[in-house]
Amino acid sequence: LVPHLGDREKRDSVCPQGKYIHPQNNSICCTKCHKGTYLYNDCPGPGQDTDCRECESGSFTASENHLRHCLSCSKCRKEMGQVEISSCTVDRDTVCGCRKNQYRHYWSENLFQCFNCSLCLNGTVHLSCQEKQNTVCTCHAGFFLRENECVSCSNCKKSLECTKLCLPQIENVKGTEDSGTT
């Protein structure tokens, strides 16, 4: 089975690599524009130059192309705690990241939020914090993991998942309460 190609891919595949088919004359292959530039005018004929112009400030193209407009530079989202790692250039989009001791959580493919790495208080670090993953903590006895923090078993209610981890403590508390009644 031949995979379905979009119109643009079909047109491009007729020409050698680095060239594209002229939109008005499919017998002409024009040279693509270099990264950092965009297509201003198609080449007038075979072997003639494509008119490519440099992207204006605030826009970029990161690969060879025949785009009629450069792409708008991304902005780092302050409300998500993002900081600029490197600014936008004509051939590279803005790179956004997180501060030291923070990790990225991706809510969707193109949206991340920065959160502080867990310190594993009342526990030990099982896996260190990474760029896209929080610290993995192992809690000390008498503590259970809730929202990646080690919480005292005294805060464990019977209906919660923590009952398995805190069972001895819960039994002790129950036993202490029972022994006080006469």
Epitope: K75, K78, E79, M80, H105, Q113, F115, N134, E147, N148
Partner: nanobody
Framework: EVQLLESGGGLVQPGGSLRLSCAAS????????MVWVRQAAGKGLEWVSH????????FYADSVKGRFTISRDNSKNTLYLQMNSLRAEDTAVYHC????????????WGQGTLVTVSS
């Protein structure tokens, strides 16, 4: 106590429009980034849109870009989602929420309003 109450959901035909509202109380609304998320039956939560406190430069998921508009009225403590050109795949329960701060979970979100897109 933080309270978020959504309204405006309902049954609408494909191509139709709805405007969701979220009435907020129990916190300083004007200081918080607000979020719309949705959950279709049997699926996980999907981030739809969010809007910073000043209302500038809202974010939209690719699936709703150009069709949905998020807005807020800080004087009324209310968040809105204008939904146009609705599609069957927009059918879900829509929740408004405060942007999480401590970690990747929602501490505060409403019970939701059901949007059904069907002919």
């Amino acid at each position: 106590e933080v309270q978020l109450l959504e309204s405006g959901g309902g049954l609408v035909q494909p191509g139709g429009s709805l405007r969701l509202s979220c009435a907020a109380s129990g916190f300083t609304f004007a200081h918080e980034t607000m979020v719309w998320v949705r959950q279709a039956a049997g699926k996980g939560l999907e981030w739809v849109s969010h809007i910073p406190p000043d209302g500038q430069d809202p974010f939209y998921a690719d699936s709703v870009k150009g069709r949905f508009t998020i807005s807020r009225d800080n004087s009324k403590n209310t968040l809105y989602l204008q939904m146009n050109s609705l599609r069957a795949e927009d059918t879900a329960v829509y929740h408004c929420a405060l942007l999480p701060k401590r970690g990747p979970w929602f501490d505060y979100w409403g019970q939701g309003t059901l949007v059904t897109v069907s002919s």
